[in-house]
Interface confidence: medium
């Protein structure tokens, strides 16, 4: 393979040179100041020591400056996510400088070689920032590095090498291979900027994890657990792309981090909130919907600066496309008795009725098992803003929809052939909205009828003593 960079940081690729053609050597890292939202505008190339382009292209020394850093590339060209991100930044921050860091020659190589080139690219960015700092009014605190995949670690190196501290680094699904478990100086880490926020969308605990699993920022956000992204299944991809392949699924999930960030820029009125939690399973149980003590935050561009003593892992659910925002609810269901449960876990569904809209029928995911004489917590989420909740319909699915459950039911029947009907008793459901932090209690419509069995439903209305917690704060509004 070619020598990736020479002494001046220039690409010296002597392969595939057409005969009798000009072979001007170009810098391997170029800084393209985007002067328009249109990708057709060529922008202006900035280079250290050359002040004229800064003047010609109206570089605003007092404004925010974004550096967008791409990652490894198989095609050797810029992908469309870059255009969408540039456009969104220009829309949101009209006076800002948006600089695309073009390191395509060093990224369009074997992945391992591209990884080895991240350090030199980080150095180039740091040199550019050091030079800009020599200018009056330019502040490193106004600099926001946004790196996707391998570009996130490039941003980390840049933040590490620069003289001073950059204001913010956003890591968009930082690359996993060769970085997972690496020393903090060899990957993106919290000490690379004043605020480091990270979105993880393609992490896998089995097989190859394209995105890094470990937390690497001040806040690390794992949408949908950080692994399977809605709308990115093979079926979804096959439906939307002429030649859908597993590669498209990987691209869809890995690139989702970028689109979530773009969404936070363009759909400012529909912010998505993430909630601090120790792990994905606890979040799925609905345990982690608190906003107390900075336990929740907006995701993407609108994230509030949090410099925690240790990494803060945060979770949320999203829709399959823009706007990605969903509305999270914690449901606490106290099961005070049950009859003849057998081996099989019940399959519950809820429908929420609100002042603005009614939800679809939502499954209650049983992460472990239903506990008797205990409060069972569930997470449900809706794509619509339901407004204030009025009533809840709880349904116990009758006929099993999985072969596994059918088999378990059959075994239960064999062991207890005269098994009378299974039954659960539920008096109330406590609901907490993640987005408003409001808590409400719902009681059965008929206080005498609290039992539910397969194929039946139970209705709950706001209890007379419906309550909301006064000391909780909402991510959107401060509650009294």
């Amino acid at each position: 393979s070619p020598v990736p960079f020479g002494p001046e940081g220039r690409l010296e690729d002597k392969l595939h040179k057409p005969k009798a053609t000009q072979t001007e050597v170009k810098p391997s890292v170029r800084f393209n100041l985007r002067t328009s939202k249109d990708p057709e505008h060529e922008g202006c190339y900035l280079s250290v020591g050359h002040s004229q382009p800064l003047e010609d292209c109206s570089f605003n020394m007092t404004a925010k400056t974004f550096f967008i850093i791409h990652g490894w590339t198989m095609s050797g060209i810029f992908e469309n996510w870059l255009h969408k991100l540039v456009s969104a930044l220009h829309t949101r921050e009209k006076d800002a400088n948006v600089v695309v860091v073009d390191w395509l020659p060093l990224a369009h190589q074997l992945y391992t070689d591209a990884v080895n080139n991240t350090r030199v690219v980080g150095h180039s960015i740091a040199r550019m920032l050091d030079w800009l700092q020599e200018k009056d009014d330019f502040s490193l605190g106004n600099v926001h590095l946004i790196g996707y995949s391998l570009g996130a670690h490039v941003a980390g190196y840049a933040g590490n090498f620069v003289k001073g501290t950059v204001g913010r680094i956003t890591g968009l699904d930082p690359a996993g291979p060769m970085f997972e478990g690496a020393d903090i100086h060899k990957r993106l880490s919290p000490d690379d900027a004043d605020f480091v926020d990270v979105l993880h969308t393609y992490t896998r605990s089995f097989g190859l994890s394209i995105g890094i699993q470990m937390p690497v920022g001040h806040i690390d956000i794992y949408p949908n657990g950080g692994d399977f992204q809605p709308g990115c299944g093979l079926n979804d991809v096959l439906g939307s792309i002429a030649y859908g392949t597993i590669t498209e699924v990987v691209k869809c999930e890995h690139e989702r981090a970028v689109h979530l960030f773009v969404d936070s820029l363009v759909n400012q009125d529909k912010p998505s909130f993430a909630f601090q939690c120790t792990d994905s399973n606890r979040f799925k149980k609905g345990i982690c919907l608190s906003c107390r003590k900075n336990r929740c935050n907006s995701i993407g561009y609108n994230a509030k600066k949090m410099r925690n003593k240790r990494n803060s892992k945060m979770y949320l659910k999203t829709r399959a496309g823009m706007p990605f925002r969903v509305y999270h609810y914690q449901m606490k269901i106290h099961v005070f008795s049950y009859k003849n449960m057998g081996e099989i876990e019940p399959t519950f569904y809820v429908t929420l009725y609100g002042t603005n809209a009614d939800s679809q029928t939502l499954p209650l995911e049983i992460v472990e098992r239903i506990e008797q004489n205990a409060t069972n917590t569930f997470l449900v989420y809706t794509e619509e803003d339901l407004g204030d909740l009025l009533k809840i319909q709880l349904t116990w699915e009758g006929a099993s929809q999985s072969w596994y459950n059918l088999w378990k039911e059959f075994r239960s029947y064999l062991s207890q052939p005269r098994n009378p009907g299974r039954e659960l008793n539920i008096r109330r459901i406590r609901v907490k909205s993640g987005e408003t932090q409001r808590k409400l209690t719902f009681c059965t419509e008929d206080p005498e009828n609290t039992s539910i069995s397969p194929g039946r439903e139970l209705w709950f209305r706001k209890c007379r003593d419906g309550w909301r917690m006064k000391n909780e704060t909402s991510p959107t509004v401060e509650l009294p």
Epitope: E40, E42, N80, L82, K84, V100
Partner: antibody
Framework: QVQLVQSGAEVKKPGASVKVSCKAS????????MHWVRQAPGQGLEWMGS????????SYNEKFKDRVTSTRDTSISTAYMELSRLRSDDTVVYYC????????????WGQGTTVTVSS | EIVLTQSPATLSLSPGERATLSCRAS?????MYWYQQKPGQAPRLLIY???NLAPGIPARFSGSGSGTDFTLTISSLEPEDFAVYYC?????????FGGGTKVEIK
């Protein structure tokens, strides 16, 4: 190899509309903006507008803005340019041209579609 | 809009001679692009970002200039170089082309 194949020649009456297609092959259609450029006989080149096939965003020359519409069908990797309220001076050759976002030039062109406007 | 004026309109030269084509912009542009067009064919990119040679273009073609004045030079004309040449800018929409310079055999 990269190819842009345009639809055949058209003869239209003044006031009518024409829709020219440009079928792309040999590359990922959604990764490049498609532009439309026209050329009158023996004259220079004139940029009309563009479409980003990835999400359908369009950009037009003000001169044609109220008459031109760019669309695309990603399932068949085809871009379309429709020009309405045709006049005799629209008798020109229409080209589609591929533009690499941030690469900065028209690297591949269609073969051209001749549109004749005559009563 | 930015108007690009090419001169001369026609250049009559012999094979082996040097051709110098000029393109002047009505206001400053960041970069200039040059295309070659032969009768009945679509334009073909020669130069991008003012001085960069497009893939497969012979080294006898070169571009230079800045601001409002740009030049395309063909160091030694080959028979296949006789064609019309257009300059173009991407600095400001609408993206405009020059009127063209026809290089013909003397």
């Amino acid at each position: 190899q990269v190819q842009l194949v345009q639809s055949g020649a058209e003869v239209k009456k003044p006031g009518a509309s024409v829709k020219v297609s440009c079928k792309a092959s040999g590359y990922t259609f959604t990764e490049y903006t498609m532009h439309w450029v026209r050329q009158a006989p023996g004259q220079g080149l004139e940029w009309m507008g563009s479409i980003n096939p990835y999400y359908g965003g369009t950009s037009y020359n003000e001169k044609f803005k109220d008459r031109v519409t760019s669309t695309r069908d990603t399932s068949i990797s085809t871009a379309y340019m429709e020009l309405s309220r045709l006049r005799s001076d629209d008798t020109v050759v229409y080209y589609c041209a591929r533009y690499g976002n941030y690469v900065g030039y028209f690297d591949y062109w269609g073969q051209g579609t001749t549109v004749t406007v005559s009563s | 809009e930015i108007v690009l004026t090419q001169s001369p309109a026609t250049l009559s030269l012999s094979p082996g001679e040097r051709a110098t084509l000029s393109c002047r912009a009505s206001s400053s542009v960041h970069y200039m692009y040059w295309y070659q067009q032969k009768p009945g064919q679509a334009p073909r990119l020669l130069i991008y970002y003012t001085s960069n040679l497009a893939p497969g273009i012979p080294a006898r073609f070169s571009g230079s200039g800045s601001g409002t004045d740009f030049t395309l030079t063909i160091s030694s004309l080959e028979p296949e170089d006789f064609a019309v040449y257009y300059c173009q800018q991407f600095t400001s929409s609408p993206y405009t082309f020059g009127g063209g310079t026809k290089v013909e055999i003397k």
